[in-house]
């Protein structure tokens, strides 16, 4: 569909005569009839197959025709057609004299024709005007013409229909040749497919509008490239959906069992060294000057009574200092300037001369000690607490604070490691000298039977239509992740075709 446009520009009839040679009275009031036909080698009588158009009286004798496309569209003249433009045509333009206002052929005088021209030729669709001039004996007509496509028609012969749209059926504008040009964010033959967010995973993501990234089941993240781990997975990751691969230091079905208490909780204080010793179990090796299970207690260096001969101990930031009684000196007041003559032995101790009286030694009664028998005996000195227990003086008595796993007055009894039921999933516990051992039931393994090794529910390939199978470790069942276009627990139903149930 298109329009043949004819722009009449100038008509010259200087003598003001008709084709018959008779002059017009008072002048030739000129109008035009136009006939557009299919190409004929010799222009023949018959229908104006591409259309006809007539003008009103445009002038008298010689005149220029004003461009009137803005006001009513009389010039250029419009000859619309609703078929494929063939590229060739025949054009007949007649100039007629109208003495009155009635321009019908039957109302005109018998010799009202002024001139007639006929041209044939090729004409491609385009915006450019072709200028032509036809001269007869007494008249001259200057005109131009072109063929353009109607709205929504494109191509070399206006045969390509293209109507821009931005709706469910497409999102495009039309190129000059009639091909579709997708609006930004759309693609496909009819620009119906949205272009998803850049980087959106091809398989795991999709979109219903441009720059969107919606995730398929089992996937998450801005680009749907992160798998969703098993529900309840605490300290684990996945490479495919519903997995729970434990981070280092974690174990168990949901990676919630702490196998690296030291790193995760840093229980040892004051720069102590931490050693993992099982699930939620650890040992702290204290730096000098500290004690306690977590080395949380600061040891006073004077607690070990380093000062001899009745010297008094003073704690300092970087150690201790002994204040020696008269007659003694040295770091620990170990050197004496006294002799037995000075009665240096306290609490009934007896003095013995040494080195020809230059020195002495005290022999202490029971319950007293020290180079001058100045100290009561420390019941902890003999380190009576076994298995690393900590000895504490409590007045006249003493007591042992035991490390985990030991009991008894002197921490001499080994608590059964199995008492805490450390073996998961019904594993059998065996006490060993240095700990315990779990014997696991079928389907489980690991130090504490925490790792499930049950049969892979996906082994039987239960999912249809190329769906991805994931094993649900907590229930020994499988989960099918359906591809686009399928539904059902095994992805067995195409979308839009409900299952036919037998009842």
């Amino acid at each position: 569909s298109g329009v043949f446009q004819l722009q009449l520009q100038e008509f010259i009839n200087e003598r003001g005569v008709l084709a018959s040679g008779r002059p017009c009275e008072p002048g030739c009031r000129t109008f035009f009839r136009v006939c557009l036909k299919h190409f004929q080698a010799v222009v023949s009588p018959g229908p104006c197959t591409f259309g006809t158009v007539s003008t009103p009286v445009l002038g008298t004798n010689s005149f220029a025709v004003r461009d009137d496309s803005s006001g009513g569209g009389r010039n250029p003249l419009q000859l619309p057609f609703n078929f494929t433009w063939p590229g060739t045509f025949s054009l007949i333009i007649e100039a007629w004299h109208a003495p009155g206002d009635d321009l019908r052929p039957e109302a005109l005088p018998p010799d009202a024709l002024i001139s007639k021209i006929a041209i044939q030729g090729s004409l491609a669709v385009g915006q450019n005007w072709l200028l032509d001039e036809q001269t007869s004996t007494l008249t001259r007509l200057r005109y131009s013409y072109r063929v353009i496509c109607s709205d929504n028609y494109y191509g070399d012969n206006c045969s390509r229909l293209c109507k821009k749209r931005n709706d469910h059926f497409g999102h495009y504008v039309c190129q000059p040749d009639g091909n579709l040009s997708c609006l930004p964010g759309w693609t496909g033959e009819y620009c119906q497919q949205p272009i998803c967010l850049s980087g959106c995973h091809e398989q795991n993501g999709y979109c219903s509008k441009p720059a969107e990234c919606l995730c398929r089941p089992g996937w998450q993240g801005r680009l749907c490239n992160e798998c969703i781990p098993h529900n309840g997975c605490r300290h684990g990751t996945c490479s495919t959906p519903w997995q729970c691969t434990c981070d280092e230091g974690w174990g168990g079905l949901f990676c919630d069992q702490d196998l690296n208490y030291c790193t995760h909780h840093s229980p040892c204080k004051n720069g102590a060294t931490c050693s993992n010793s099982g699930q939620r179990s650890y040992t702290c090796t204290c730096r000098p000057g500290y004690t306690g299970v977590d080395c949380e207690l600061e040891l006073s260096e004077c607690d070990s009574n380093p000062c001899r001969n009745g010297g008094s101990c003073k704690d300092q930031e970087d150690g201790y200092h002994c204040l020696c009684p008269p007659g003694y000196y040295g770091l620990h007041c170990e050197h004496s300037t006294l002799s037995c003559a000075d009665s240096p032995c306290f609490n009934g101790g007896s003095c013995r001369e040494r080195n020809q009286g230059a020195n002495y030694a005290c022999e202490c009664p029971p319950n007293f000690t020290g180079s001058n028998c100045e100290k009561k005996v420390d019941r902890c000195t003999s380190n009576p607490c076994a298995n690393g227990g900590q000895c504490l003086n409590r007045g006249p008595s003493r007591m042992c604070r035991c490390r985990p796993g030991f009991t008894g007055t002197y921490c001499e009894l080994h608590v059964s490691d199995c008492a805490r039921n450390p073996c998961a999933h019904g594993g059998t516990c065996h006490d060993l000298e240095n700990g315990l051992m779990c014997t696991c039931p079928a389907g489980f393994s690991g130090r504490r039977c925490e790792v499930r090794t049950s049969i892979d529910a996906c082994a039987s390939s239960p999912c249809f239509n190329r769906a991805t199978c994931y094993t649900d470790l907590s229930t020994d069942t499988f989960v099918c992740n359906c591809p686009y276009g399928f539904v059902g627990s095994r992805c067995e139903f195409p979308v839009g075709l409900p299952p036919s149930f037998p009842w």
Partner: antibody, heavy 119, light 111 residues
Amino acid sequence: QVQLVQSGAEVKKPGASVKISCKASGYSFTAYYIHWVKQAPGQGLEWIGYISVYNGATNYNQKFKGRVTFTTDTSTSTAYMELRSLRSDDTAVYYCARDYDYDVGMDYWGQGTLVTVSS
Amino acid sequence: DIVMTQSPDSLAVSLGERATISCRASESVDNYGISFMKWFQQKPGQPPKLLIYAASNQGSGVPDRFSGSGSGTDFTLTISSLQAEDVAVYYCQQSKEVPWTFGGGTKVEIK
């Protein structure tokens, strides 16, 4: 009113030529075409061809080409058909008719001219 | 050449009755949606008279009882109510291609 008046009957010998006239009136002669049609006695109509009055362009039926010529005289609004090398089967009534570019068809006809070819 | 075949050759119809004449072209006479088909009436001793042009358009001064129809290769001329003055020979004619050709004619008479 539109009229096409043809010349009178002609009797010719075989091998001779005949020129029939068709005088138009009541319309702009130059704007139209003139057709020529043959009708043998008791027979149907047979198209011979046409001439475009405004530019003299002609179109002949191949069957008559070489023996027929169309001409016009715009000063007298007359069209002519000359048929040469006459044969006995050229005996017929010959009609002129006008036609136009806007497809009404051959809407006005002359009364016909009888040409008899006989030795 | 395009051959035009008319049927029947002759037709006798009662006054006031419908008369139908068919014309078949050896190839389509349509071009750009227009049928290059005409119907003529010829009474004895007279030149032909144009009845129908472009298959279905009535010529100037033609009574309404004459109508034409068809496209492509098959065309029909119908006289809805035959009158005494309609006795004549009717011709179809194509003008799509040179040479223009006529049908053989159909003679219409009163029954």
